[in-house]
């Protein structure tokens, strides 16, 4: 068969080869399409209902007025000259609609180093077949699921016309030290071949760099933590940034009870307040920051003291808020 | 709101002529097809004529063909019917019905206007 | 020309009941049928169109169905308001061809 791709809305004309280019004709057309369930014939006598889809025309060939999706399918005459000789014609109709320029929307002005970020969503409106859309940083295209890229896709179908919406969503996690204005575009590649890319027009985004943040440091006293029963235990949590943010104090993983203090004493130490220390900087600008750990214990006499104090790991970092 | 409204129904003699008319509104006239159905009192729906939406085609059962016209106006968003030689069987009400293709059949369709033949 | 048989030609029933008309065309019209009621003095309101699909503002009671060239009209539950008659029409070629006619009456 004789492949034939036409656009939506457009006429299409098939030849019947060898029909006689005049009546009278001994030939028909089936059809096998969207608008039918088996074969539909169509004569040049004919003449009814199916003319505003399909109608044979005085030389025989076949005339669609105005294509559209229920159109794809096969399209086949047999016709027979004035000797008696039969010609068979077999087409294979595929339709296809441009969409509109496709854009982005939702777009961020400004994005932030080594987090993710929605960076905008492309949307593409009717197009057929579907096609795709795929995204561009700087001229080249960003494969989804590497280095930090993210996309979420969404196809939607109209009801009455059949015709595609597509929505792209990106996200991204510029690299700290990356490019300060990346440039994002998007584009939408036909469903069928032959046809160009359409592209949008770029976005440029600001990357912020946010501050690195000086760690949070818990100074125990004494070294080590350690200490005699009744003794006494002094935690000092020291932030170097400005302005000074809220000090709270946790045991074991869980929040203390007390007013929030820079400062933490713990007069005549008993068993009860052996555990693991720390404290959580909470700055306006950056959310919690958790000091490293540090483990509060009690000597019985004549026991020796751990050098350095039995200390755990660095804490969680920057904690996620929710 | 889709409305189509016929007018220029009556009481004719035999062998006269009679011209319906069918105001369409509610829709975009020069997409449809367009047709002509009938009802004789007491009986079912006959197809009387259809045209298609550019007016160029014209369809007709062999029971009024030579006889009635259909035709249209896009620009009056109108649809027509001229009757010619009229008959005491052609006595009935005629409905004007959008459509009459395979994309639409017959969708919506007007109150009707009666046409008498008698002597 | 296409033949539409439609049957029966009317039919007494209740409120409630289950209701079947059937249009059988005398050849292939594919899924060109539309189903129609017409009330005394009133214009056909289509019900049905391509056979199987329910027209806009129509009630789910009504529904349509296709095996090979017979044609089917189901009320699920006869209303008070769906007494009336009930036409097919074939539209897949010309002549255009509706059906007898169904009444529909009370028992």
């Known amino acids: 068969a004789q492949n034939i791709t036409a656009r939506i809305g457009e006429p299409l004309v098939l030849k019947c080869k060898g029909a006689p280019k005049k009546p009278p004709q001994r030939l028909e057309w089936k059809l096998n399409t969207g608008r039918t369930e088996a074969w539909k014939v169509l004569s040049p006598q004919g003449g009814g209902p199916w003319d505003s889809v399909a109608r044979v025309l005085p030389n025989g060939s076949l005339f669609l007025p105005a294509v559209g999706i229920q159109d794809e399918g096969i399209f086949r005459c047999q016709a027979m000259n004035r000797n008696g000789k039969e010609t068979k014609s077999n087409y294979r109709v595929r339709v296809y609609q441009i969409p509109g320029k496709p854009e982005i929307v939702d777009s961020a002005s400004e994005l932030t180093a080594g987090v993710p970020n929605k960076v905008g969503t492309c949307v593409s409106e009717g197009s057929y077949p579907a096609g795709t859309l795929s995204w561009h940083l700087d001229g080249k295209p960003l494969v989804p699921n590497e280095k930090g890229v993210s996309v979420k896709e969404q196809t939607r179908r109209h009801p009455e016309t059949g015709l595609f919406t597509l929505q792209s969503e990106l996200m991204v996690t510029p690299a700290r030290g990356g490019d300060p204005r990346p440039t994002f575009s998007c584009s939408f590649s036909p469903g069928l071949p032959r046809h160009r890319a359409l592209r949008t027009a770029p976005i440029q985004p600001r990357v912020w760099e946010p501050v690195p943040l000086e760690e949070v440091q818990l100074v125990v006293e004494p070294e080590g933590g350690a200490v005699a029963p009744g003794g006494t235990v002094t935690l000092t949590c020291e932030v170097p940034a400005q302005p000074s943010p809220q000090i709270h104090w946790m045991k074991d993983g869980v929040p203390l009870p007390l007013p929030p203090s820079p400062v933490l004493i713990l007069p005549e130490i008993g068993p009860q307040d052996q555990g693991t220390y720390s404290c959580v900087a909470t700055h306006s600008s950056h959310g919690p920051q958790e000091s490293r750990a540090v483990s509060i214990s009690i000597i019985e006499p004549g026991e020796e003291g751990p050098t350095a104090g039995s200390v755990g790991g660095s804490g969680l970092g920057t904690l996620a808020l929710a | 709101e889709v409305q189509l409204v016929e007018s220029g129904g009556g009481l004719v003699q035999p062998g006269s002529s009679l011209r319906l008319s069918c105001a369409a509104s509610?829709?975009?006239?020069?997409?449809?097809?367009m047709t002509w159905v009938r009802q004789a009192p007491g009986k079912g729906l006959e197809w009387v004529a259809s045209i298609d939406n550019s007016g160029d085609n014209t369809y007709y059962p062999d029971s009024v063909k030579d006889r009635f016209t259909i035709s249209r106006d896009n620009a009056k968003n109108s649809l027509y019917l001229q009757m010619n030689s009229l008959r005491a069987e052609d006595t009935a009400v005629y409905y004007c019905?959008?459509?009459?293709?395979?994309?639409?059949?017959?969708?919506?369709w007007g109150q009707g206007t009666l046409v008498t033949v008698s002597s | 020309d296409i033949q539409m048989t439609q049957s029966p030609s009317s039919l007494s029933a209740s409120v409630g009941d289950r209701v079947t008309i059937t249009c059988r065309a005398s050849?292939?019209?594919?899924?060109?049928v539309n189903w129609f009621q017409q009330k005394p003095g009133k214009a056909p309101r289509r019900l049905i169109y391509?056979?199987?699909n329910l027209a806009d503002g129509v009630p789910s009671r009504f529904s349509g169905s296709r095996s090979g060239t017979d044609f089917t009209l189901t009320i699920s539950s006869l209303q008070p308001e769906d007494f009336a008659t009930y036409y097919c029409?074939?539209?897949?070629?010309?002549?255009?061809?509706f059906g007898g006619g169904t009444k529909v009456e009370i028992k």
């Open positions: 029409l074939e539209f897949d070629e010309h002549p255009l061809t």
């Open positions: 509610g829709f975009t006239f020069n997409n449809y097809w």
């Open positions: 019905a959008r459509g009459g293709d395979i994309t639409t059949g017959l969708d919506y």
């Open positions: 050849q292939d019209v594919g899924i060109y």
């Open positions: 391509r056979a199987t």
